[in-house]
């Protein structure tokens, strides 16, 4: 779509003659007829295929034609076309004399031809005018012409329509060839896609206007590259949305079960040793002189039975002293005035003389100890049972009675409550402090998923894309376990699609 523009500049007919050789009376009142058509090697009569136009009377005999932008006698003349400009044309310009109306001479009777010119050739679209002058025996015409594109049409042949716009269907201006030039911050074939904030994650972020970064469900952070962990996840992180991967020392569905109570809470006092024993479980092993669950109680100085050979212990404020039985002396009654002749060894112990009869030593039979084999052996004094196990003397040996959840000679092994698969109907087992907890699949509930239910949170099938639905820890809540490639609280969002991709 474009316009062929013809600028008439000067016409000379000094003798005031018509084409038939007769003079005009009183002078040649001149108007022009223009016919524009497709290129013809030999110009022929017929329709003006590219358009035609007539002028009012522009002057008498010889005259200069001024530019006029409005009203009658507009100059340059406009011949609009609504097709692709072919680059070639034929143009016929006829000068006529009219005896009648100045403004619409075309309709007057008695019009006579003064002269005509015909040009055929090629013409490229452009702003520059092509000037020409045609002379014949009687007349001379000076004119120029060009082809320009109509508003919003572009390209070599004015065939490319482009209208600049700045709305949600495009944000662009038009290049000289009609291609789109996106406004800053916009991209895409139609410049309708905003360029998001630099670094905004390609899949997890999006924007509605330039330099924005809005996060898709399951993602957060200024660049939408941080996943949102499962709601209620206490001491855990995620690599994909709604995950809850526990930090070291934490366990359970929401990473709220403390597996390292010793480090996190330091419950054992007075230099005692702390041993973890399952979620929130621990045991304190006290140093000599302390007792209590947390070794917080100080024992009496005599509690460690420091007096030997039957000596009796007396507590003082910061110390103790031993009252020795006859035949013994020393701070702890450790020295004896007896010899083997005095039969000092009890419970079948055998006596050995030492230091030329000055002293003796008793060799005790099994299960007895002490200077004189006077004490029964307590094999539990070293606290050999871990994880709060109870030590029992059993004749020549001792055994550990373990707390629930532990086994082994010294109760050192943790039994998984889940090892015996207590969850029915495909429930997922979690070891917690108070025993196993089952996360039930859709349609089941109860401590062991043993109860079949018809109306639970999963019954409506809230999970998409083949995800497995779990009712969590109560039937009214559900958790969707997404298959690979999907995220979201209901697994409704595919990961890694191109921008056309919803979410």
């Amino acid at each position: 779509s474009g316009i062929f523009q013809l600028r008439l500049q000067e016409f000379a007919n000094e003798r005031g003659m018509l084409a038939n050789g007769r003079p005009c009376e009183p002078g040649c009142r001149t108007f022009f007829r223009i016919c524009l058509k497709h290129y013809q090697a030999t110009f022929s009569e017929g329709p003006c295929t590219f358009g035609n136009v007539s002028t009012p009377v522009l002057g008498t005999n010889s005259f200069v034609i001024r530019d006029k932008n409005s009203g009658s006698g507009r100059n340059p003349l406009q011949l609009p076309f609504n097709f692709t400009w072919p680059g070639t044309f034929s143009l016929n310009i006829q000068a006529w004399h009219t005896p009648g109306d100045d403004l619409r001479p075309e309709t007057s009777p008695g019009n006579s031809l003064i002269s005509q010119i015909i040009i055929q050739g090629s013409l490229a679209v452009g702003k520059n005018w092509k000037s020409d002058e045609q002379n014949n025996t009687l007349t001379r015409l000076r004119y120029s012409y060009r082809v320009v594109c109509s508003d919003n049409y572009y390209g070599d042949s004015c065939s490319r329509l482009c209208k600049k716009r700045d709305d949600h269907f495009g944000h662009y201006e038009c290049q000289p060839d009609g291609s789109l030039s996106c406004l800053p911050g916009w991209t895409g074939k139609y410049c309708d896609q905003p360029i998001c904030l630099s670094g905004c994650h390609e899949q997890n972020g999006y924007c509605s206007k330039p330099d924005e970064c809005n996060c898709r469900p399951g993602w957060q952070g200024p660049l939408c590259n941080e996943c949102i962990p499962h709601n209620g996840c206490r001491h855990g992180t995620c690599t994909i949305p709604w995950q809850c991967a526990c930090d070291e020392g934490w366990g359970g569905l929401f990473c709220d079960q403390d597996l390292n109570y010793c480090t996190h809470h330091s419950p054992c006092k007075n230099g005692s040793t702390c041993s973890n024993s399952g979620p929130r479980g621990y045991t304190c092993t006290c140093l000599p002189g302390y007792t209590g669950e947390h070794c917080e109680l100080e024992l009496s100085k005599c509690a460690s039975n420091p007096c030997r050979n039957g000596g009796s212990c007396k507590d003082h404020e910061n110390s103790y002293h031993c009252l020795c039985p006859p035949g013994y002396y020393g701070q702890h009654c450790e020295h004896s005035t007896l010899t083997c002749a005095d039969s000092p060894c009890f419970n079948g112990g055998s006596c050995r003389e030492r230091n030329q009869g000055a002293s003796y030593a008793c060799e005790c039979p099994p299960n007895f100890t002490g200077s004189n084999c006077e004490k029964k052996v307590d094999r539990c004094t070293s606290n050999p049972c871990a994880n709060g196990g109870q030590c029992l003397n059993r004749g020549p040996s001792r055994t550990c009675r373990c707390r629930p959840g532990f086994t082994g000679t010294h109760c050192e092994l943790h039994i998984s409550d889940c090892a015996r698969s207590p969850c029915a109907h495909g429930g997922t087992c979690h070891d917690l402090e108070n025993g196993p907890v089952c996360t039930c699949p859709a349609g089941f509930s109860g401590r062991r998923c043993e109860v079949r239910i018809t109306n639970d949170a999963c019954a409506s099938g809230p999970c998409f894309n083949g995800a497995t639905c779990y009712t969590g820890l109560s039937p009214n809540n559900f958790v969707c376990n997404c298959p690979y490639g999907f995220v979201g609280s209901r697994c409704e969002f595919p990961v890694g699609l191109p921008p056309s991709f919803p979410w």
Epitope: N152, L161, D167, H168, F169, C207, S208, S500, P502
Partner: antibody, heavy 121, light 106 residues
Framework: EVQLQESGPGLVKPSETLSLTCTVS??????????WGWIRQPPGKGLEWIGD???????YYNPSLKSRVTISVDTSKNQFSLKLSSVTAADTAVYYC?????????????WGQGTLVTVSS | SYELTQPPSVSVSPGQTASITCSGQ??????ASWYQQKPGQSPVLVIY???KRPSGIPERFSGSNSGDTATLTISGTQPMDEADYYC?????????FGYGTRVTVL
């Protein structure tokens, strides 16, 4: 072939909120080439554009209705919805949902069959 | 607000040409679309981007747009073309419809 289907109550009381849903089938509402619009036509009158929405949630509203209109999208259900609050008898119309194509420079090539909503007590 | 003005009605004899105009300020600088709506039916897009026809729309429908006026032309009008016709354009981010023209085939 893409199809759009409006649904919602045919009768709403004055001062209440009109709620309609458009379900798209045969194509994804999440394509980057389309906006999804609502247009209404009072009985015996012409078409009036209400507003439109992109799959990301960006919305554009007719300034004359903006204070009362909310359009939302649910990509997981391939649906978009219209809420028009504080309705009066002047809001009685056939409500159409339509697809506006970026490639067609905003022309609407697919329309729902329309649903008549009457505002009356 | 931006307005598009259409004549309320246009009458045409079968086989003749019907021209429907749509006027708006500098409408030629916007893309115009045209919709046909028959009684009891949804509108149908017949022209987009001033002069382009969607697939399935007969060649007798054509469009132009320049200055302040867009025109829908139906050449060789048929009785089945009797309908209401609406022009539409976008003013920034707002869709604007013309008031509609009833085309009657005599």
């Amino acid at each position: 072939e893409v199809q759009l289907q409006e649904s919602g109550p045919g009768l709403v009381k004055p001062s209440e909120t009109l709620s309609l849903t458009c379900t798209v089938s045969g194509g994804s509402i999440s394509s980057s080439s389309y906006y999804w619009g609502w247009i209404r036509q009072p009985p015996g009158k012409g078409l009036e554009w209400i507003g439109d929405i992109y799959y990301t949630g960006s919305t554009y509203y007719n300034p004359s209705l903006k204070s009362r209109v909310t359009i939302s999208v649910d990509t997981s259900k391939n649906q978009f919805s219209l809420k028009l609050s504080s309705v009066t008898a002047a809001d009685t119309a056939v409500y159409y949902c339509a697809r506006e194509d970026v490639i067609l420079r905003g022309g609407s090539d697919y329309w729902g069959q329309g649903t008549l909503v009457t505002v009356s007590s | 607000s931006y307005e598009l003005t259409q004549p309320p009605s246009v009458s045409v004899s079968p086989g003749q040409t019907a021209s429907i105009t749509c006027s708006g300020q500098r409408l030629g600088d916007k893309y115009a679309s045209w919709y046909q709506q028959k009684p009891g039916q949804s509108p149908v897009l017949v022209i987009y981007e001033d002069s382009k026809r969607p697939s399935g729309i007969p060649e007798r429908f054509s469009g132009s747009n320049s200055g302040d006026t867009a025109t829908l032309t139906i050449s060789g009008t048929q009785p089945m073309d009797e309908a209401d016709y609406y022009c539409q354009a976008w003013d920034r981010d707002t869709g604007v419809f013309g008031y509609g023209t009833r085309v009657t085939v005599l």
